[in-house]
Interface confidence: low
């Protein structure tokens, strides 16, 4: 079978399975919520738009105020537990092998030269990344492990030729603010690649990432907060220089709020993130003083 056909077949099978899985999850959540007399969760947000292009060169790039970022999607329903909810084991394990094989097929073929030469390649790469990130939250640990390896392999193989697309797909997953494992998989990989974002894309990325980081800081899962705390220094080292004072304050306030958390992990990660935001801002000393004053105010 031609490489492209194999790829499309694997895409379709995996996509339809993941959609079934999501529907099952939603149904179970709805049942649980109805038992608790709660309204069902809102539908997932629509797929995010493409990142805005850098402003045309005739317009000032740095000092000018930027248009406000798009409003965040509606907040998710009650947070999903870190471990997936119990699902009928038999029904899922029957297709576990298929899902592993589909991931491997996509992985093998998306890096093949024949597919890379296809005019549809950018679109195919987008779908592949989306599916690997979806599978990072699969109920089966084997599928999760393979999806994780596939993400690493594809990023490594296509970094030189398709870095902007890879960065965009990871950003889209962060913006989605979905399942904890998928979010973490995207967050730490985006952070690793942040220093490779083209200089003129740094400001647009920053503007779009700020509401995402603020939203992620409100997630209750400790594992998400651990990943976020590891990602923030790398993201800010690349983009902090492009943030204005107000944007830095908004981000700092989000982490300061977490210092009141009952979880020691969330308090610790928030403190680390706040310090690295100050460290990588344009006015380091000013923000250290500002943060110190706010913290002293919390003690009074």
């Amino acid at each position: 079978m031609a490489t492209l056909e194999k790829l499309m077949k694997a895409f379709e099978s995996l996509k339809s399975f993941q959609q079934q899985q999501q529907q099952q999850q939603q149904q179970q959540q709805q049942q649980q919520q109805q038992q608790q007399q709660q309204p069902p969760p809102p539908p997932p947000p629509p797929p995010p738009p493409q990142l805005p292009q850098p402003p045309p060169q005739a317009q000032p790039l740095l000092p000018q105020p930027q248009p406000p970022p798009p409003p965040p999607p509606p907040p998710p329903g009650p947070a999903v537990a870190e471990e997936p909810l119990h699902r009928p084991k038999k029904e899922l394990s029957a297709t576990k092998k298929d899902r592993v094989n589909h991931c491997l097929t996509i992985c093998e073929n998306i890096v093949a030269q024949s597919v890379r030469n296809s005019p549809e390649f950018q679109k195919l790469l987008g779908i592949a990344m989306e599916l690997f990130l979806l599978c990072s939250d699969d109920a089966e640990s084997d599928v999760r492990m393979v999806a994780d390896e596939c993400l690493n392999k594809v990023i490594k193989a296509l970094m030189d030729s398709n870095l902007p697309r890879l960065q965009l797909e990871l950003y889209k997953e962060i913006k989605k603010n979905g399942a904890p494992r998928s979010l973490r998989a995207a967050l730490w990989r985006f952070a690793e690649l942040a220093h490779l974002v083209r200089p003129q894309k740094c400001r647009p990325y920053l503007v779009n990432l700020l509401p995402c980081l603020t939203r992620t800081s409100k997630r209750p899962e400790e594992s998400v907060q651990e990943t976020l705390a590891a990602a923030v220094p790398k993201i800010m080292a690349s983009f902090g220089n492009f943030a204005n004072d107000n944007e830095i304050k908004v981000l700092l306030k989000a982490f300061i709020a977490n210092l009141k958390s009952s979880s020691p992990t969330i308090r610790r990660t928030a403190a680390g993130s706040a310090v690295s935001i100050c460290q990588h801002s344009r006015r380091t000393q000013y923000f250290y003083s500002w943060l110190l004053n706010v913290l002293l105010g919390l003690l009074v």
């Epitope: 005739a58 000032p60 790039l61 740095l62 902007p164 083209r198 200089p199 003129q200 220089n241």
Partner: antibody, heavy 121, light 110 residues
């Protein structure tokens, strides 16, 4: 439009350091970024590194990492390039180029006249 | 280091149009690499013609234009003149803002 004036030609011995200056005639020095480029006589251009006068952020090409230091002095409206542990193959014309980062964060718009650095024992 | 390639030599007749290109040895050039073009005549400092793919530097005549052609960056000189005879260099900005120059093209106006 900004003009860049570089320091004069110098002779150095292997192992020495050289410091080349690049003075910018502008009232808004801190909005500029400076790129340093060198050209071995008869050869092509080689990108060395970049510095923002706004915040001192720098970017160095790996091959110069550890030997090259770029700095700016806002009060003197001057950018500096220091290259240490000179070798004979560092003999080249060193250019500074500037761009107003209000419009374009990285890049080269205006060039200095160049400074010939000769390294010979 | 990623290698940026240019045609070593090129010739054009006076009044003719010439397109010089700038390619990555591996991969395609897109506007995300913010290609810039420079002209250098013997004994002179380089002069910026184009930056960020197609933005002309101040004082550069409109007959110089930049674009992306297929998988390469391109500099087109329309209505070539004798004083266009020079070396032309492109630079591409890699990740994190490191610039890499092409080897240059020696343009002859015959």
């Amino acid at each position: 439009e900004v003009q860049l004036v570089q320091s004069g030609a110098v002779m150095k011995k292997p192992g020495d350091s050289v410091r080349v200056s690049c003075r910018a005639s502008t009232y808004s020095f801190s909005t500029y970024s400076f790129t340093w480029v060198r050209q071995v006589p008869g050869q092509g251009l080689e990108w060395m590194g970049w510095i923002s006068a706004y915040n001192g952020h720098t970017n160095y090409v790996d091959s110069f990492q550890g030997r090259l230091t770029l700095t700016t002095d806002t009060s003197a409206s001057t950018a500096y390039m220091e290259l240490r542990s000179l070798r004979s193959d560092d003999t080249a014309i060193y250019y500074c180029a500037a761009v107003d980062t209000t419009y374009y964060y990285y890049g080269m718009d205006v060039w200095g006249q160049g400074t010939l650095v000769t390294v010979s024992s | 280091q990623t290698v940026v390639t240019q045609e070593p030599t090129f010739s054009v007749s006076p009044g003719g149009t010439v397109t010089l290109t700038c390619a990555l040895r591996f991969g395609s050039v897109s506007s995300s690499y913010y290609p810039s073009w420079f002209q250098q005549t013997p004994g002179q400092a380089p002069r910026t013609l184009i930056y960020s793919t197609n933005t002309r530097s101040s004082g550069v005549p409109a007959r110089f234009s930049g674009s992306i052609l297929g998988n390469k960056a391109a500099l087109t000189i329309a209505g070539a003149q004798a004083n266009d005879e020079a070396d032309y260099y492109c630079v591409l900005y890699m990740g994190s803002g490191i610039g890499v120059f092409g080897g240059g093209t020696k343009l002859t106006v015959l």
